[in-house]
């Protein structure tokens, strides 16, 4: 099966790689603009240069293109705890991340919030904190795992999900999420 192509993809596929078909004259293939630039004017004819201009401050293109405008640079979301890892340049968007000892939680495909890595007090580190995953803690005896923190079994009330983790006969309790909730 041939995948469905949009009009722009159809037009581009007629020309060799690195070129695009002139929008007003489909017998002309123009050279695409380099990353960091955008299309100001199409090439006037075969073998003639495309008029490409450098992106202005606050905008970028990260690959060869025939865009009429550069893309706006992303801004890191301070209210999500994000920090700027690298600034926007004409050929690369801003890179946002989290501070040291923090991990990312994605609320959507493109939006993440930074959270502090758990320290595993009253427990031991089972798996270290990673870019997109909190530390996994194993709790000492007499403690249970709650939101990835080890909490004293004295805070465990009867009939709550911690009861099975705080049975006195269990010597070493490995904290787990309450069953059926993940």
């Amino acid at each position: 099966l041939v995948p469905h192509l949009g009009d722009r993809e159809k037009r581009d596929s007629v020309c060799p790689q690195g070129k695009y078909i002139h929008p007003q004259n489909n017998s002309i293939c123009c050279t695409k603009c380099h990353k960091g630039t955008y299309l100001y004017n199409d090439c006037p004819g075969p073998g003639q240069d495309t008029d490409c201009r450098e992106c202005e401050s606050g905008s970028f293109t990260a690959s060869e293109n025939h865009l009429r405008h550069c893309l706006s640079c992303s801004k890191c979301r301070k209210e999500m705890g994000q920090v700027e890892i690298s600034s926007c340049t004409v050929d690369r968007d801003t890179v946002c991340g989290c501070r040291k000892n923090q991990y990312r939680h994605y609320w959507s495909e493109n939006l993440f919030q930074c959270f502090n890595c758990s320290l595993c007090l009253n427990g031991t580190v089972h798996l270290s904190c990673q870019e997109k995953q909190n530390t996994v803690c194993t709790c000492h005896a007499g403690f249970f795992l709650r939101e990835n923190e080890c909490v004293s079994c004295s805070n465990c009330k009867k009939s709550l999900e911690c009861t099975k983790l705080c049975l006195p006969q269990i010597e070493n309790v490995k904290g787990t999420e309450d069953s059926g909730t993940t």
Partner: nanobody, 120 residues
């Protein structure tokens, strides 16, 4: 047994308000980030809002900021979503969900949902 039971959905005119409730049983909501996820017809799940166990930290999707307010009553083990200035694009099934932090977007454990219809 862990259960989340949503209520408060219904038919409302554009510009109107609704308050959704989520009664939790089998676990204590004050221990967890909790939130609301929605799914519009023919679309995927999306996080609308979430709140930390203490209530001191919240998340709102850009599309609902300034219109929706999330809150919780830990003594009643209940989560709420006050929805004001409702728009046609807010129509969806709304699910109460336990947030599973890290990676994502993931939608953790959620209830059966309550339908919100916005129509004149």
């Amino acid at each position: 047994e862990v259960q989340l039971l949503e209520s408060g959905g219904g038919l409302v005119q554009p510009g109107g308000s609704l308050r959704l409730s989520c009664a939790a049983s089998g676990f204590t909501i004050e221990w967890y980030w909790m939130g609301w996820v929605r799914q519009a017809p023919g679309k995927g799940l999306e996080w609308v809002s979430a709140i930390s166990g203490s209530g001191g930290s919240t998340y709102y999707a850009d599309s609902v900021k300034g219109r929706f307010t999330i809150s919780r009553d830990n003594s009643k083990n209940t989560l709420y979503l006050q929805m004001n200035s409702l728009r046609a694009e807010d129509a969806a099934v709304y699910y109460c969900a336990k947030v599973k932090l890290g990676g994502g977007p993931n939608f953790g454990y959620r209830g059966q949902g309550t339908l919100v219809t916005v129509s004149s």
